[in-house]
Interface confidence: medium
């Protein structure tokens, strides 16, 4: 006859663990027993549990409640035992001797792989902010056995560092990913994705990319400067800028305070029916939490019956 | 060949403890399984408990948590502590030893009296 096991028996933290032991006899023979035993490199055999056929599954006391027959029905040159909820501490070397009548003893070994599924963590790194050269955008840690695979997953173009750290029965895994903040980044998303055999399918973690910035501000309204005449109505100003955070927006007027009647509503300045009076130079100031940016135009109300009094010289040059 | 004598019986009340141990004339390391069994007057033998070599255990139901079977392999003896003792667990106490070879040897000894009354 012959022994029928595996080599390695892999098995998930928590899960049980099915260590196969069947003996293929000839007709007529019979299993009086069987013992098995841990028996790790450098250490003595640790009896686990032993099978009799007549007195029945005896438990080692270090293992008491967790080794079980597999359940009916049993075929009586079946030695399988179920390890019950593995541990990491179960990793490692089982024997599994049988004692057979008349055919006498027969052993064989296998390996208990007892994989622990990682609970990976991300950590953003500091404030991104645009001018920045390259930045930590975020850090992403895994601690597995084996050691799980920590990558990427973006649209962002960016560099990435691993580095590994071993322990006695398992490794953490840290990926860094690092990026030139830039303003086309903000609201992408930032994925790390880790990978190991003890997972059905890959973790996923997301963080959305926050860039801090301020673009240039500009005024809007004066383009036709003929529409900018005495008692026109509906006149106004409209300042343009973005940013992250959103920022705010506040009117001044340079030479002096702001006319009477003019509404400032966040980036747009409302004017009343036009007068000589609203002619100045008006700054939008925007600003958040990054910076702050300037924009100033002057305003020039036009006198229709001025102009209409006024000569053009035209004053060539060659 | 292997001779088993018992010792620690004795009359107890119901609630009480004994304590009964089996010495082996041979090494109990080579004696692959070691254990009980008893016989109540005018019943069938009846299963108790075993240990192996390794020190793994089995109960019968009837007795599991209040009696614990152990072995000192230094010293050829195996234990029955049995605990929360009953009426029904009056019967002669047998001290079992098997020897694995080319085929099972068992042996036995010849029984000590437990008798729990009031």
């Known amino acids: 006859g012959e022994l029928e096991t595996s080599d390695v028996v892999t098995v998930v933290l928590g899960q049980d663990a099915k260590l196969p032991c069947f003996y293929r006899g000839d007709s007529g023979e019979q299993v009086g027993q069987v013992a098995w035993a841990r028996v790790d490199a450098g250490e003595g055999a640790q009896e686990l549990a032993l099978l009799h056929s007549k007195y029945g599954l005896h438990v080692s006391p270090a293992y008491e409640g967790r080794v079980e027959q597999p359940p009916p029905p049993r075929n009586p040159l079946d030695g399988s035992v179920l390890l019950r909820n593995a541990v990491q501490a179960d990793e490692g070397e089982y024997e599994c001797r049988v004692s057979t009548f008349p055919a006498g003893s027969f052993q064989a070994r296998l390996r208990l792989r007892v994989l622990v599924p990682p609970l990976p963590s991300l950590n953003p790194g500091p404030a991104l902010e645009e001018g920045q050269g390259l930045t930590l955008a975020a850090s992403c840690t895994a601690e597995g056995s084996p050691a799980p695979s920590v990558t990427w997953d973006t649209e962002v173009k960016g560099t990435t560092s691993s580095r590994s750290f071993k322990h006695s029965r398992s490794a953490a895994v840290t990926s860094e990913f690092h990026l030139v903040p830039s303003r086309s980044m903000n609201g992408q998303p930032l994925t790390c994705v880790v990978s190991h055999p003890g997972l059905l399918q890959d973790q996923r973690i997301t963080h959305i990319l926050h860039v801090s910035f301020l673009a240039e501000a500009s005024v809007r309204g004066l383009e036709d400067q003929n529409l900018w005449h005495i008692g026109r109505e509906g006149a106004m100003l409209k300042c343009l800028s973005e940013g992250q955070p959103p920022p705010s927006y506040n009117w001044t007027r340079l030479d002096g305070p702001l006319p009477s009647g003019v509404r400032v509503d966040g980036d747009t300045l409302g004017f009343p029916p036009l007068t000589t009076e609203h002619s100045g130079i008006y700054v939008c100031h925007v600003s958040n939490e990054f910076s702050s940016r300037d924009s100033q135009v002057t305003v020039d109300v036009l006198d229709p019956q001025e102009d209409s009094g006024k000569q053009v010289d035209l004053v060539s040059a060659s | 060949e292997v001779q088993l004598v018992e010792s620690g019986g004795g009359l107890v009340q119901p609630g009480g403890s004994l304590r009964l141990s089996c010495a082996a004339s041979?090494?109990?390391?080579?004696?692959?399984?070691m254990g009980w069994y008893r016989q109540a007057p005018g019943k069938q033998r009846e299963y108790v408990a075993t240990?192996?070599?390794?020190?793994?255990?089995n109960y019968a139901d009837s007795v599991r948590g209040r009696f614990t079977i152990s072995r000192d392999n230094a010293e050829n003896t195996v234990y029955l502590q049995m605990d929360s003792l009953r009426a029904e667990d009056t019967a002669v106490y047998y001290c079992?030893?098997?020897?694995?070879?080319?085929?099972?040897?068992?042996?036995w000894g010849r029984g000590t009296q437990v008798t729990v009354s009031s």
């Open positions: 041979r090494s109990t390391f080579s004696l692959n399984i």
């Open positions: 240990i192996t070599s390794g020190g793994s255990t």
């Open positions: 079992t030893a098997e020897l694995v070879r080319r085929g099972p040897t068992t042996y």
